[in-house]
Amino acid sequence: MACLGFQRHKAQLNLATRTWPCTLLFFLLFIPVFCKAMHVAQPAVVLASSRGIASFVCEYASPGKATEVRVTVLRQADSQVTEVCAATYMMGNELTFLDDSICTGTSSGNQVNLTIQGLRAMDTGLYICKVELMYPPPYYLGIGNGTQIYVIDPEPCPDSDFLLWILAAVSSGLFFYSFLLTAVSLSKMLKKRSPLTTGVYVKMPPTEPECEKQFQPYFIPIN
């Protein structure tokens, strides 16, 4: 037997203040024995990678032995709920999303590892995991509290060819600058090395006298 029931409105409870403790006791003790709603757990926050990929685990507490499970990812943003992707799988088998789906996933027992790809900053929002136990009956439905996925667009990378051109231009500029600098430096050095006295040669004595011979300095006149 499937599970469903209603609780009396607060305003109506005031009309029968004598009976409300019994009603409350009924809901607290009697109903949970016969009925366990399916709880779905998922992380509160996930940050998408720089490549726009976000992964999170969706775990459900199955009240029965389900063989066929349907998992749906909903997105809530700007007062709108949209279906991102959905997959039905047999327990023990892999999740199969549609070929054009942005979702992929794997299942392990009562856990579903979901991956959403191709996300951009504008896709930031609350991603809700909805789990339905399709077979065997009864049908059970559980909806998680949602995972807030934050997507930050990376800084746009310039074209690689453009980068190469910049690199080539900078290195060429540096090369020509260093070449020019070297040329200027060499020309200055050569100018500094020009002789001060033209046509005069002075023979200097050796530092250590050889065989007591002494040489007098002499001049060679230039005609």
């Epitope: 029931g5 109903i31 909903l74 279906e83 998680g144």
Partner: nanobody, 130 residues
Framework: QIQLVESGGGSVQAGGSLRLSCAAS????????MAWFRQAPGKEREGVAT???????RYADSVKGRFTISTDSAKNTLYLQMNSLEPEDTAMYYC????????????????????????WGQGTQVTVSS
């Protein structure tokens, strides 16, 4: 399998009243959200009124002060009392139950909120003539 059966719809003159009922076939856990949705021809389904597990209610701006959502746990029934009906209220009215009360209040003024509700009735037609 949970079954929701609506009744109480019909044709009424503008300014008149109707009371919609939604009978449930079984009980559920304490955590849930009950709602009334409506869908006019050629329009999207919209949330009219919701009731949380603790009895908190919320209404669409267009029906505030005119419609009242309530329950009777003894009869396991959800109600929608509609007063001062207008021709714009003409639509198919659906009763729905969702498993997570977190989205109960958001079901109003949120497009696509029907995704949060897994159990639906077959609907009852309400026609308001001027």
């Amino acid at each position: 399998q949970i079954q929701l059966v609506e009744s109480g719809g019909g044709s009424v003159q503008a300014g008149g009243s109707l009371r919609l009922s939604c009978a449930a076939s079984a009980y559920t856990d304490r955590r849930y959200c009950m709602a009334w949705f409506r869908q006019a021809p050629g329009k999207e389904r919209e949330g009219v009124a919701t009731m949380d597990t603790d009895g908190s209610t919320r209404y669409a701006d267009s029906v505030k002060g005119r419609f009242t959502i309530s329950t009777d746990s003894a009869k396991n029934t959800l109600y929608l009392q509609m007063n001062s009906l207008e021709p714009e209220d003409t639509a198919m009215y659906y009763c729905a139950v969702g498993p997570n009360p977190r989205y109960c209040s958001g079901a109003i003024n949120t497009r696509g909120a029907e995704h949060y509700f897994g159990y639906w009735g077959q609907g009852t037609q309400v026609t308001v003539s001027s």
